[in-house]
Interface confidence: low
Amino acid sequence: WQVPRPPTWGQVQPKDVPRSWEHGSSPAWEPLEAEARQQRDSCQLVLVESIPQDLPSAAGSPSAQPLGQAWLQLLDTAQESVHVASYYWSLTGPDIGVNDSSSQLGEALLQKLQQLLGRNISLAVATSSPTLARTSTDLQVLAARGAHVRQVPMGRLTRGVLHSKFWVVDGRHIYMGSANMDWRSLTQVKELGAVIYNCSHLAQDLEKTFQTYWVLGVPKAVLPKTWPQNFSSHFNRFQPFHGLFDGVPTTAYFSASPPALCPQGRTRDLEALLAVMGSAQEFIYASVMEYFPTTRFSHPPRYWPVLDNALRAAAFGKGVRVRLLVGCGLNTDPTMFPYLRSLQALSNPAANVSVDVKVFIVPVGNHSNIPFSRVNHSKFMVTEKAAYIGTSNWSEDYFSSTAGVGLVVTQSPGAQPAGATVQEQLRQLFERDWSSRYAVGLDGQAPGQDCVWQG
């Protein structure tokens, strides 16, 4: 599957990148789908996670593959191309002025990426502008070795950021999840994602989302009124991909946000979340870093109860057991807690209305020198029917103006040993966290404690 190397900004001539889409602007490259599919797909999905250092789990509790290990394996697998959609890059300790041994895994990853370029494997990175990591040199280092980097000006285009975190490798393998390209995501922040191997149909579908970012990364790009047909998705909530994952009948599709970055056939991220919630009959378990039934980045903030209402409706109207596990760290905005208490106040076991909210507090311990770390950064939801793994926090802006993706997977129980479906694996990981000593009920988390571990 040979991908022509896309031009970097320096090679792009203004005449090649008209500001107006009426004059035509095609993707930098198009996947050679027929060629890619000559190799038979044998899709496999592996849940991956990062557990912050010094956060021991109970012996024998379920776990997923370590994220750092999975990323290094994916890069070892690469033969032709690695495409990375990322919010920002900060893979080395000096990026943020920190000297800590826990940055070594990130530094090893950066080294591996440089080796990749040395092996003449194409690396294309779409990253956000504006960015969080203004002092990071990772992308300059990679660009100097031949990586193609485009900054996607989401601020100008939608008043948001590119918050996605996914990889497409050789048009066959995928990583997506909550982890940024940041060393802290590997050792200091709790993350959850998925790696899908040998699945060109899904990989090339996610590649189309990467392409939406790529074409918007040229100077003067504007959002098209209608995306050209070659960006369209054939997989969505009405027509998901059907395949065997390790022999298990599976349906899956990728969703995207904001709506302006959803070409024809692409399910909107919010719609995907609501559909998964709406189909639940037994339970909805969600683990998210932030939960605000408001806007977060517009002033004054607006009330936005869409997800809140869906959880309430499921619990109250259908007797679905709702559990919400929310991140709680030194940078958590305390104005979130009244909303969490309000949601939990709906709970009325006598009337078969079950809503429970806890916060997950990662003890800082002796890691206080590392800013913006020691927090549950996950963004996933699981029901008895489906698993949803996303890149968005739960407030309006992440669905209306910020670029993100979601993965919805459903596997059929019964065709394999109990406990093997993706949704069952994800439920076990959720319940491990929910029942751990780091998950604190709201009653035990009085305002003013500032998410400091009291253990």
Partner: antibody
Amino acid sequence: EVQLQQSGTVLSRPGASVTMSCKASGDSFTTYWMHWVKQRPGQGLEWIGAIYPGNSETSYNQKFKGKAKLTAVTSASTAYMEFTSLTNEDSAVYYCTGGYSDFDYWGQGTTLTVSS
Amino acid sequence: DILMTQSPSSMSVSLGDTVSITCHASQGIRSNIGWLQQKPGKSFKGLIFHGTNLEDGVPSRFSGRGSGADYSLTINSLESEDFADYYCVQYVQFPPTFGSGTKLEIR
């Protein structure tokens, strides 16, 4: 919020060149286009051109090609416009403007008077 | 280049009135339009971006609407500080082009 601070009033002779500046503060200077706009009384607003400081790409109104030259120094978060071969027609107020939606934030304007 | 036709060129109105200013583009501009305010002897202030969105700090009595090639700025319940010149600007493609302006005067 972005603030744009422009250089002061300029008085110049026909045939001369002048450079005016626009210093940005409050947001990442490299992530939005910086535009320059001309306003003459009774003549409406004319777009001169724009520069994308992130990679120094420029785009000019055909009318001002060869007349205006746009540059930017990212380390100083400052955009510059050099105006050459001045004539009386160049007497006007010149504004820099930028932001994620192109015309969100405006400088206070630089008045250029060309007189012999 | 896209021609932006703005109307009216001026209007005399009273405090408390509601006024609308329109801009017609010579082709569809997909809401890539901004509205600007300029007070006499002063610089410009962005009011609306992307057709309908208020810039930070702009009072909610200002609103924008429209689609395709036709857009409008409405000011409800005019206050004394609203008497100024107003311009539309399209930025769907380079070169950006401006409307000719509307002068709002006190009757």
